[in-house]
């Protein structure tokens, strides 16, 4: 997977009046890395690993960048002409990637009230607009504003691309991201299925990086894909990931089955516990909402695009 840096900024307005704050989160390699703390007026690292990336350096540069971007986005929202009454949101997502072959990608996407209306490839400076008439109108509106703003010149977009990559390289240089390995905690549970059958579930949690092999084995041989059910590998909000795999087996044959886990060159096997342990899987499976993003989005049903 490529290394990536992703900026998520959102500003809100009510009856055309744009709020003075903004919401921002930065993800590094898919993990929550920084967020803008409005109360402290600063970019704050998300967890110890994020702090380790910059070591004893301050986050002033990140704060300055996010504040500047937030200000730009507020101005952009203020210039959207079709703002009707009520609550509206403008979200900008900017992503840059460095691939294994050292090639790079950068893009920028704008969403209004959760709907994508404008994308730009920051390398080719090519704009893409979805077909809907609303998106076309919004895109024209925003592009005209960006053109009027002397800052938003060809050089500006090149700089956005270069700055994002420069920051990503700076973070990677610390070695923290590249070296970081958190082994999973593996937990096997069983629950009643139908007559004579039980469902066994193997959960791996709190691991990093996200690449993992988790599979059920019978007598040491991996079960076929179609006899197993896998959960997505999802961020758990703590800078690590979680996933699960389940299968249905005959009661009494538990000792023939093991959960096999492979992660970052290490592997382990985990037997099915004896006894009847009933578990609710739904909570665990769905416990992956907006990676600790401000509750505002949850409360106001503002869509946060991943």
């Amino acid at each position: 997977e490529p290394h990536s840096l992703r900026y998520n900024l959102t500003v809100l307005s009510w009856d055309g009046s744009v709020q003075s704050g903004f919401l921002a989160e930065v993800h590094l390699d898919g993990q929550p890395f920084l967020r803008y703390d409005r109360q402290k007026c600063r970019a704050k690292p998300q967890g110890q690993w994020a702090e380790d990336v910059l070591g004893n350096k301050t986050w002033d540069r990140e704060t300055r960048d996010l504040t500047g971007n937030g200000k730009d986005l507020r101005m952009t929202l203020a210039h959207i002409k079709d703002q009707k009454e009520g609550l509206h949101s403008l979200q900008e997502i900017r992503v840059c990637e460095i691939h294994e072959d050292n090639s790079t990608r950068s893009s920028q996407h704008f969403y209004y009230d959760g709907e994508l209306f404008l994308s730009q490839n920051l390398e080719t400076e090519e704009w893409t607009v979805p077909q809907s008439s609303r998106a076309q109108t919004l895109a024209m509106n925003v592009r005209n504003f960006l053109k009027e703003d002397a800052m938003k010149t060809k050089t500006h977009y090149h700089a956005m691309h270069a700055d994002c990559l420069q920051e990503l390289r700076r973070y990677l240089e610390s070695g923290v991201v590249l070296r970081r390995t958190v082994p999973p905690m593996v937990n096997v549970t069983r629950s009643e299925a139908s007559e004579g059958n039980i469902t066994v579930t193997c959960r791996a949690s709190s691991f990093y990086p996200r690449n993992i092999i988790l599979t059920w084995r019978q007598d040491g041989v991996s079960l076929s894909h179609d006899t197993q059910q896998w959960g997505d590998v999802l961020p758990d909000g703590n800078g690590t990931y979680q996933t699960w795999v389940a299968t249905r087996i005959c009661r009494g044959e538990e000792q023939r089955f093991t959960c096999y886990m492979e992660h970052s060159g290490n592997h382990s096997t985990h037997p099915v516990p004896s006894g009847k342990v009933l578990v609710l899987q739904s909570h665990w499976q769905h416990h992956h909402h907006h990676h600790g993003l401000n509750d505002i989005f949850e409360a106001q049903k503002i869509e946060w695009h991943e």
């Epitope: 703390d37 509750d295 409360a299």
Partner: antibody
Framework: EVQLEESGPGLVKPSQSLSLTCTVT?????????WNWIRQFPGNKLEWMGY???????NYNPSLKSRISITRDTSKNQFFLQLNSVITEDTATYYC?????????WGQGTTLTVSS | DIVLTQTTSYLSVSLGGRVTIACKAS??????LAWYQQKPGNAPRLLIS???SLETGVPSRFSGSGSGKDYTLSITSLQTEDVATYYC?????????FGGGTKLEIK
């Protein structure tokens, strides 16, 4: 523990300038947060006047913009309020407080009377 | 500017009773609201931020609720030390403004 303490003249004549100082202990004003001035009029109405952020940027209440200035002395960990051309309606208790959105630490306040 | 209205200026409640103090904003403020308690001769003290988040050290009998334009501070099992004036404050956009206050007394 974070502590803020206001100090000032107590009495100012109309049309003069008012200068107040907020001394912060237990926290560096250049670390983070915004550092605010808030006043409370005799009828208990509270008014946010403005702030200076940890980085030195300022934001003022538009109702006071032409008269207000907030500055700081980082070596003394102090920030200041200057209000020009005061009138009797500026009589109030003046508080300094910490926070970029809401105010989690306040000083005890200093009472200022504008009178000739 | 956003105006915060606390319609009830005075409230008289029995000891051990339940109190709700309302705060209405002139615009949608997206839960960006704080509640303060002020006792005579003291500075205001932060109780709740983001409409519902209780500050450290604030008794659990205090709670905040609401959304959009309408917000409420609730106090269950009223104690004598809760006698004070309560203010709401928004931080949707500058200038940040305060409500006019609700003075709470024991019946």
């Amino acid at each position: 523990e974070v502590q803020l303490e206001e100090s000032g003249p107590g009495l100012v004549k109309p049309s003069q300038s008012l200068s107040l100082t907020c001394t912060v202990t237990g926290y560096s004003i250049t670390s983070d947060y915004a550092w605010n001035w808030i006043r409370q009029f005799p009828g208990n109405k509270l008014e946010w006047m403005g702030y200076i952020s940890y980085s030195g940027s300022t934001n003022y209440n538009p109702s006071l913009k032409s008269r207000i200035s907030i500055t700081r002395d980082t070596s003394k960990n102090q920030f200041f309020l200057q209000l020009n051309s005061v009138i009797t309606e500026d009589t109030a208790t003046y508080y300094c407080a910490r926070g970029g959105t809401y105010f989690d630490y306040w000083g005890q306040g200093t009472t200022l009377t504008v009178s000739s | 500017d956003i105006v915060l209205t606390q319609t009830t200026s005075y409230l008289s409640v029995s000891l051990g009773g339940r109190v709700t103090i309302a705060c209405k904003a002139s615009a949608h403020i997206n839960n960006w609201l704080a509640w303060y308690q002020q006792k005579p001769g003291n500075a205001p003290r932060l109780l709740i931020s983001d409409a519902t988040s209780l500050e450290t050290g604030v008794p659990s009998r205090f709670s905040g609720s609401g959304s959009g334009k309408d917000y409420t501070l609730s106090i269950t099992s009223l104690q004598t030390e809760d006698v004070a004036t309560y203010y709401c404050q928004h931080y949707w956009s500058t200038p940040w403004t305060f409500g006019g206050g609700t003075k709470l007394e024991i019946k």
